[in-house]
Interface confidence: low
């Protein structure tokens, strides 16, 4: 009875409820850069203001007939998905539309840039509350479009974009590849990636999360009361723009980094069938489907972290890959991964006043990835402590020696091409939890942080026999900040965090043989912030109203005679 | 945007007297780069976004655009400034022949130039 997409983004315990009040997302303005729209459609009438901005190329073909309903189709549907009276996510959000796509759904990078500039100027002339910009479009990789998105994001605007419908790496497209933009892929009612004809949703490390994007019911421009089903990553992005509007309306002071972390945190985890993605993209693609938070407050105490993958280093011997966190996130740990297993580890290093995570390829390697663990840790003071390769056979050790600093991550980097099988003791000496241990020929880097109320602990899971994957997870209430492998020997492909689980991958068992060299331990560093928890309790004590759990409650809907239309 | 074609001849005449050496030369050792869409059918040659260095003021953007027009006119090329950017990125959008790219890349304040390309509803 309820459209599957609205049910999917609703927190489970609210599914029984029937209603969502008319002002969910009401403190937020959502800008839509798309086709023209039918602003008098009953779904969006009075909710969408059509600006006078228009910058579109001529339609192709001499026989093209401009038909209003076709010209308005894409934008009208998306406006309905974001804020439609019946089928919208954020029914209270106000929208403003800019026309950057023509009647064939085609625009230009330059027209989009001028549109983004128009939004920035409007924001300066008349500052309002939080702004969300929805970009349900994609072109080839564009340095200038990505740069414009970065500037607008740094001005406090939340940009949400479609990952693209090319069944390809989203990093090859813009604005999907802009790191500051929230990039959304599309899934269907079965939580599978959406197939669109011979193509489908884009994927890869530039996608932040997925959202419903197939058979989405929304306003049709065929008539002022018509509805239609459309599919695509635009529809998925519109869901996330709506969810963002709901979150920002409940917490208007949220920064882009905080919003992105919350979107990731409240997503459904590990429900997408990754077999649909190309094998080399599976590890890079987030297995997350967007959902609304169950309530406004209570999220504040959480230590939020996300995993950021670098671009591939390429195969040259000295190639490196760099993963960076957003400006107001802290890099709490750094790891690396190589499919061939040939790598020379990773290290945290300062770049432009911020820590970055750099991974090093090795001779004969096909390339490496750097994996950064990026966290929201207010008032944090983090530094990296390094120990050079040890002379002794015991292995290299480094610990956080400053008062009040705790260990959040361990990295190791080596210059030798192959660490060989010499392995240090896997277990740390008791009473020294703030210590990183590594191979004697590797330099070890400890990420040490001081932040109010921050506490961390090390959790290990060792497998004596060879195994392709070893995992260790942090328990409820703790957040994974660091993920590494012991020992750092050559058969370990690398380590990376997936949500709250540390994954260590090793070479195929058949190639390793079941020697003692197959023993691998996954080491997770789990942290929590007592300070954030306390601040959140104080906030809840002084806040009346029950927030999003009142604002977003699913609707019971009965469907009749809707058409199907794919974009 | 208003159509500037009508004012074009007058503008060119006014700029012809400007000598190349009068304005600042590009900083030593920094070379502006040219970018274009990797997907050939999506390219829109003939329209270019000239992106200037981060701290460039609007007046400098306008001056750089006029300078490009003057130098192009001297070589017998017609150019049209479609938009001057400020607020997000400093720069301008210009309709011109690809033959002028080398010249444009040498202009002062230029960070990079990108050929316009198509975007599509998803």
């Amino acid at each position: 009875s309820i459209p599957w997409n609205l049910e999917r983004i609703t927190p489970p315990r609210y599914r029984a409820d029937e209603y969502q009040p008319p002002d969910g997302g009401s403190l937020v303005e959502v800008y839509l850069l798309d086709t023209s729209i039918q602003s008098d459609h009953r779904e969006i009438e009075g909710r969408v203001m059509v600006t006078d901005f228009e910058n579109v190329p001529e339609e192709d073909g001499t026989r093209f007939h401009r038909q209003a309903s076709k010209c308005d189709s894409h934008g009208t549907h998306l406006a309905g998905v974001v804020s439609g009276r019946d089928a919208g996510v954020a029914k209270g959000a106000s929208m403003r539309s800019l026309r950057v796509l023509n009647c064939q759904g085609k625009g230009t990078v330059s027209g989009t840039l001028i549109g983004l500039e128009f939004i920035r100027k409007s924001q300066l002339v008349q500052p309002v509350g939080p702004l969300v910009v929805l970009l349900p479009l994609a072109g080839g990789y564009s340095r200038v479009l990505n740069a414009a998105c970065q500037r607008l994001a740094r001005a406090g605007v939340v940009l949400v974009t479609a990952a693209g419908n090319f069944r390809d790496d989203a990093c090859l497209y813009s604005p999907a590849s802009a790191p500051e933009v929230i990039t959304v892929g599309a899934t269907n009612a079965q939580d599978q990636p959406v197939t669109l004809g011979t193509l489908g949703t884009n994927f890869g490390r530039c996608v932040d999360l997925f959202a419903p994007g197939e058979d989405i019911i929304g306003a049709s421009s065929d008539c002022s009361t018509c509805f239609v089903s459309q599919s695509g990553t635009s529809q998925a992005a519109a869901h996330v723009a709506g969810i963002a509007a709901m979150m920002l309306s409940a917490e208007p002071e949220l920064t882009l980094a905080e919003l992105r972390q919350r979107l990731i945190h409240f997503s459904a985890k590990d429900v997408i069938n990754e077999a649909w993605f190309p094998e080399d993209q599976r590890v890079l693609t987030p297995n997350l489907v967007a959902a609304l938070p169950p309530s406004t407050h209570g999220a504040g105490w959480q230590l939020f972290c996300r995993t950021v993958w670098s671009a591939h280093s390429g195969p040259t011997r000295m190639a490196t890959a760099v993963a960076r966190c957003a400006p107001d996130e802290e890099l709490l740990s750094c790891s690396s991964f190589s499919r061939s297993g040939k790598r020379r580890g990773e290290r945290m290093e300062a770049q432009g006043g911020k820590l970055v995570c750099r991974a090093h390829n090795a001779f004969g390697g096909e390339g490496v990835y750097a994996i950064a663990r990026c966290c929201l840790l207010p008032q944090a003071n983090c530094s990296v402590h390094t120990a050079p390769p040890a002379e002794a056979s015991m292995g290299t050790r480094v610990h956080c020696h400053q008062q009040g600093h705790v260990l959040t991550g361990c990295s190791s980097h080596w210059e030798v091409e192959d660490l060989g099988t010499h392995k240090p003791p896997v277990l740390r000496p008791r009473g020294q939890p703030n210590q990183c241990v590594g191979h004697r020929e590797a330099s070890i880097h400890a990420s040490c942080c001081h932040a109010p109320g921050l506490e961390c602990k090390v959790k290990e899971h060792g497998i004596p026999a060879p195994q392709e994957q070893v995992t260790v997870a942090c328990e409820e209430g703790w957040t994974l900040t660091g993920c590494s492998a012991l020992p750092g020997t050559s058969h370990v492909l690398g380590a990376y965090a997936v949500d709250n689980t540390c994954v260590v991958r090793s070479r195929d068992v058949s190639t390793t043989g079941s020697t003692s060299e197959g023993a691998v331990t996954a080491v997770a560093i789990c942290c929590r912030s007592r300070h954030l928890a306390q601040a959140s309790q104080e906030l809840q004590g002084s806040t009346s109203g029950s927030g999003l759990n009142d604002i977003f409650e699913a609707q019971k809907i009965e469907w009749h005679e809707h058409h199907h239309h794919h974009h | 945007q208003e159509d500037e074609d009508g004012d074009y001849e007058e503008l060119v005449l006014a700029l012809r007297s400007e000598e190349d050496g009068l304005a600042e030369a590009p900083e030593h050792g920094t070379t502006a780069t040219f970018h274009r869409c990797a997907k050939d059918p999506w390219r829109l040659p003939g329209t270019y976004v000239v992106v200037l260095k981060e701290e460039t003021h609007l007046s400098q953007s306008e001056r750089t655009a006029r300078r490009l027009q003057a130098q192009a006119a001297r070589r017998g090329y017609l150019t049209k400034i479609l938009h001057v950017f400020h607020g997000l990125l400093p720069g301008f959008l210009v309709k011109m022949s690809g033959d002028l790219l080398e010249l444009a890349l040498k202009l002062p304040h230029v960070d990079y130039i990108e050929e316009d390309s198509s975007v599509f509803a998803q």
């Epitope: 009040p21 008319p22 009401s26 009953r42 019946d86 009361t225 018509c226 809907i557 009965e558 | -």
Partner: antibody
Framework: QVQLVQSGAEVKKPGASVKVSCKAS????????MHWVRQAPGQGLEWMGY????????KYHQNFKDRVTMTRDTSISTAYMELSRLTSDDTAVYYC??????????????WGQGTTVTVSS | DIQMTQSPSSLSASVGDRVTITCKSS????????????LAWYQQKPGKAPKLLIY???TRESGVPSRFSGSGSGTDFTLTISSLQPEDFATYYC????????FGQGTKLEIK
Amino acid sequence: QVQLVQSGAEVKKPGASVKVSCKASGYTFNDYWMHWVRQAPGQGLEWMGYINPSSGFTKYHQNFKDRVTMTRDTSISTAYMELSRLTSDDTAVYYCARQYDYDEDWYFDVWGQGTTVTVSS
Amino acid sequence: DIQMTQSPSSLSASVGDRVTITCKSSQSLLNSRTRKNFLAWYQQKPGKAPKLLIYWASTRESGVPSRFSGSGSGTDFTLTISSLQPEDFATYYCKQSFNLFTFGQGTKLEIK
């Protein structure tokens, strides 16, 4: 003029179902949501739910959601409310009322004359 | 669910009297985007369907006499009849439409 004309009184046995119709005239049926409100003898008004004729969306009050079904036939501008598994507590006058489908117009400006449903063994 | 509490539940008055009925909601009915209070007042006479008097807390429906006025914002609302006429003796209901729809229990206005 604008009118909502409801079907006649019904007498039903406990456990049975009743289907009340509401025919609209004098305005564009699709432009207004149709609500159903009931009033037990000597009691106040109780909102049951609504249907948006243009999309077919329905929203039901928690108390009725397992027993009520609201439908519409746009070709004859008529809305229907069916209530199943009737008990004597369902004895009431059932009203349909229209609400303009617009953000700020969340009020019922035209009502039907009411349909009396009596549930008795 | 939002609760609506009307008071008094009944009252006796004479023609020409000024009458005030109050309605309290369990949460604010002010829509933050439209800046309107989603509260309406209805009049019902025996054997008849309810009739809309006031919407958005204070806007009179067309055709409703000016002696009827509504006021209030947030959680506290008032319906005032400035000078009672014989045809005004009826039951009055307030109704919230901020989250779902809930009616007050009604106020019966009788002739003294």
